[in-house]
């Protein structure tokens, strides 16, 4: 039965697969979910422990400085360009992240606290 299901699903023109999510901890055996139209599949997969140790995160980005505060949304943004990806991770080449603007005092405290982390 299991084979039939996989075979039937494979007739779908293009499956989109999510990341391999280990069942426990951050590596080892787990599951990956795939979708194709209305069809879904859940397959066993394995995150090699050496890869997780090497990277910790699937996608690493290098970020610009935060932009000016956008008064209309109350947020500021910055762009990140891909620095390194786990071999099988389908990472975006650029990403944009936003965060709420804070008052000057708050910003100063935050900057001191989070030095080197942004």
């Amino acid at each position: 039965k299991k084979k039939e299901k996989v075979k039937k699903g494979s007739e779908c023109s293009e499956w989109t697969w999510g990341p391999c999510t280990p069942s426990s901890k951050d590596c080892g055996m787990g599951f990956r979910e795939g979708t194709c139209g209305a069809q879904t599949q859940r397959v066993h997969c394995k995150v090699p422990c050496n890869w997780k140790k090497e990277f910790g995160a699937d996608c690493k980005y290098k970020f610009e400085s935060w932009g000016a505060c956008d008064g209309s949304t109350g947020t500021k943004a910055r762009q990140g360009t891909l620095k390194k990806a786990r071999y099988n991770a389908q990472c975006q080449e650029t990403i944009r992240v936003t965060k709420p603007c804070t008052s000057k005092t708050k910003s100063k405290t935050k900057a001191k606290k989070g030095k080197g982390k942004d």
Partner: antibody, heavy 117, light 107 residues
Framework: QVQLVQSGAEVKKPGHSVKVSCKAS????????MNWVRQAPGQGLEWIGM????????ILNQKFKDKATLTVDISTSTAYMELSSPRSEDTAVYYC??????????WGQGTLVTVSS | EIVLTQSPATLSLSPGERANLSCRAS??????LHWYQQKPHQAPRLLIK???QSISGIPARFSGSGPGTDFNLTISSVEPEDFAVYYC?????????FGGGTKLEIK
């Protein structure tokens, strides 16, 4: 689009090391894994190893751990593969390829290395 | 290391026919399987990544299936330019490995 241009064919005597270069142009060189693959005459493809230009992290096929050294020069967007003490069985076409799981890969044109006395 | 076994070693077809190429992995590799085409004196060209994901610029007649241990590359209607050697490659674990290849030749 990434373009990879490899150095020209080499003829070496056994035991004389050889260094193949792979120069990238186009999209960011430093963001993607650079693979090295070889193909002996009339044979299939064999993976040598890979290096990530951002931090020079290298993963080598154990078969090549004492044979191949992978390096990168970020300033010139060039990857290198050096074969130490090559023997006649190392005669092959050596390819570099830049891998992105999202977009796929781009290959160099290949470099024929002939090891002969 | 993961061993990939390709079959058949040689496939003889006429243009217009359907081609089915198989690649079997020695253990489950999820969908971490890629297909390449190689013509004489050329570098390999990626056709399908991650078992079934299409590649920009590759004709729609090429499709792939998986995941698990049994994978297939299908060419719905073979064109004259498709006669070449086809390799599968796994990226599930080190070392990355290739299958021995299937030669698609004109009947």
């Amino acid at each position: 689009q990434v373009q990879l241009v490899q150095s020209g064919a080499e003829v070496k005597k056994p035991g004389h090391s050889v260094k193949v270069s792979c120069k990238a142009s186009g999209q960011s060189f430093s963001s993607y894994w650079m693979n090295w693959v070889r193909q002996a005459p009339g044979q299939g493809l064999e993976w040598i190893g890979m290096i990530h230009p951002s931090d020079s992290e290298t993963i080598l096929n154990q078969k090549f751990k004492d044979k191949a050294t992978l390096t990168v020069d970020i300033s010139t967007s060039t990857a290198y593969m050096e074969l130490s003490s090559p023997r006649s069985e190392d005669t092959a076409v050596y390819y570099c390829s830049s891998w992105s799981a999202k977009r796929g890969d781009f290959w160099g044109q290949g470099t024929l290395v002939t090891v002969s006395s | 290391e993961i061993v990939l076994t390709q079959s058949p070693a040689t496939l003889s077809l006429s243009p217009g026919e359907r081609a089915n190429l198989s690649c079997r992995a020695s253990e489950s590799i999820s969908n971490n399987l890629h297909w390449y085409q190689q013509k004489p004196h050329q570098a390999p060209r990626l056709l399908i990544k991650y078992a079934s994901q299409s590649i920009s610029g590759i004709p729609a007649r090429f499709s792939g299936s998986g995941p698990g241990t049994d994978f297939n590359l299908t060419i719905s209607s073979v064109e004259p330019e498709d006669f070449a050697v086809y390799y599968c490659q796994q990226s599930n674990s080190w070392p990355l490995t290739f299958g021995g290849g299937t030669k698609l030749e004109i009947k």
